[in-house]
């Protein structure tokens, strides 16, 4: 049960996550225009990743596309290829994840096919995280440098008589919504990686198996955890029965060299 | 058509207080802000300030804040400007003007002006 | 504030010649989000409200005869009249519409020999 949750809770945050990177990605608001200490201009520049925006003081708002692709910033280019990376991932992601699902009933799927499909888009939630949130400080990076920049030659002109207003820009919200996005999808993939550990079954090394010798004496044999990636392996604990060498879901064990005394 | 339409002179003591309305014909009156100016006789034009009837958004120059007052009446609209503690100064034609929404970004529609005298 | 200032003053023509008057800002007027020049043109006659002649420094609000263009961009403006009419007579103002408050230029009259 405490599996299921976990998974579906998973789900659920790398779901929300996943909307968060692609509103973000396409919002306009990644840079916004620094009103603070500044002329108050009639106009409010920002820009996002794929165009830039002016809303005059009649409320009137217009956008203009980046139409060139080689004339961009490579940085620019650099975070739309992380932000569009992580959404990428994340939707493979969140389909790898319906199928995996233990709530879902896909005909005959096994528990262990299940477990390996929960722990891969768990990855992939995490992998997609971690995209946005780089491709959010990049951009956040290169905002700084351009503000400080921007600062020191505020106002340029000749001799100080003719001044130019120079547009410092601070972070957006699209930079906000990025970064929380980012986390929750991260958040979302570590709790499906923990769900997938409780889905596979353990692969028994005949953990306190007994076996019957010829005679009375009996040799025992206490076995320790296998340490299991999840892919592939049984990775569920068995309640052991007392008379035999098979567990109660009737999974053969296989003798190692080790477990003969 | 687009009409703003101001009310009539008016001769006021100094100290006083006017209180003079711009009211538009022919347009979506929430859609465009309207902006203030103060013609001194036989001279230039000063920005008093603009009222935005979508969100109520007021802005004013520094020089009249204390002295102009924006207010709106929407059901009939209407933007007024009271003008307080009257002076000398004061004497000019007030004008209200729409500002485009879009383009032109620019005043495009003007009101006749309301002279205000101040003598006493 | 951002202090406009025109020039000349007053300017006395003759019908059908062309006029030129400058307008200059203390402070740049271009805003490099959209490389619009927020500079305004208006014409008011004698006892008259302003009309809108040029915005955003060269576009000419419909309605204004091809002979009215602008031209200019960060801190210096013109307005140029190709053949000058009659009805041309008038006081031409020039206006900041980038940072508040917005200001007016002083103005250019242009008078008839």
């Known amino acids: 049960m405490a599996v299921t949750a976990c998974q579906g809770l998973g789900f659920v945050v790398s779901l929300i996550g996943i909307a968060g990177i692609i509103a973000a990605t396409c919002m306009d608001q990644w840079s916004t225009q620094d009103l603070y200490n500044n002329p108050v201009t009639a106009v409010f520049n920002y820009q996002g990743l794929w165009r830039s925006c002016v809303r005059e003081s009649s409320g009137f708002t217009e956008c203009r596309g980046y139409f060139t692709l080689l004339g961009l910033p490579a940085m620019l280019q650099a975070v739309r290829a992380l932000m569009i990376v992580g959404i990428v991932l994340g939707a493979i992601g969140l389909l790898v994840s319906i199928f995996a699902l233990k709530c879902i009933r896909i005909g005959s799927m096994e528990d262990s096919a299940k477990a390996n499909m929960t722990l891969t888009s768990g990855i992939m939630f995490i992998v997609s995280g971690l995209c946005a949130i780089a491709g959010v400080s990049v951009f956040a990076n290169m905002l700084v440098t351009n503000f400080w920049m921007s600062t020191a030659n505020m106002y340029t002109g000749m001799g100080g008589m003719v001044q130019t207003v120079q547009t410092r820009y601070t972070f957006g919200a699209a930079l906000f919504v990025g970064w929380v996005a980012g986390g929750l999808t991260l958040i979302g993939g570590v709790m499906m990686c923990i769900a997938c550990r409780g889905l596979a079954p353990e692969e028994t090394n005949y953990k306190a198996v007994s076996y019957h010798a010829s005679g009375h004496s009996v040799a025992y044999k206490p076995g320790g955890f296998k340490a299991s990636t999840g892919f592939g392996s049984n990775t569920k604990n068995k309640k052991i029965y007392d008379g035999g060498a098979r567990t109660e879901d009737e999974v053969q064990s296989y003798p190692s060299k080790h477990d003969y005394v | 058509q687009v009409q703003l339409q101001q009310s009539g002179g008016e001769l006021v003591k100094p100290g006083a207080s006017v209180k003079m309305s711009c009211k538009a014909f022919g347009y979506t009156f929430t859609t465009y802000p309207i902006e203030w100016m103060k013609q001194n006789h036989g001279k230039s034009l000063e920005w008093i300030g603009n009222f935005h009837p979508y969100n109520d958004d007021t802005k004013y120059n520094e020089k009249f804040k204390g002295k102009a007052k924006l207010t709106v009446e929407k059901s009939s609209s209407t933007v007024y400007l009271e003008v307080s503690r009257l002076t000398s100064d004061d004497s000019a034609v007030y004008y209200c003007?729409?500002?485009?929404?879009?383009?032109?970004?620019?005043?495009?529609?003007w009101g006749q002006g309301t002279s205000v005298t101040v003598s006493s | 504030d951002i202090v406009m200032t025109q020039s000349p003053s007053s300017l006395t023509v003759t019908a059908g010649e062309k006029v030129t008057m400058s307008c200059k800002s203390s402070?740049?007027?271009?805003?490099?989000?959209?490389?619009?020049?927020?500079l305004t043109w208006y014409q008011q006659r004698p006892g008259q409200p302003p009309k809108l002649l040029i915005y955003r420094a060269s576009s000419r609000e419909s309605g204004v005869p091809v002979r009215f263009t602008g031209s200019g961009s960060g801190t210096d403006f013109t307005l140029t009249i190709s053949s000058v009419q009659a009805e041309d007579l008038a006081v031409y103002y020039c206006q900041n519409d980038y940072i508040y408050p917005y200001t007016f230029g002083g103005g250019t009259k242009l008078e008839m020999n």
């Open positions: 003007a729409r500002r485009a929404y879009g383009y032109p970004y620019a005043m495009d529609y």
């Open positions: 402070q740049s007027l271009l805003n490099s989000g959209n490389q619009k020049n927020y």
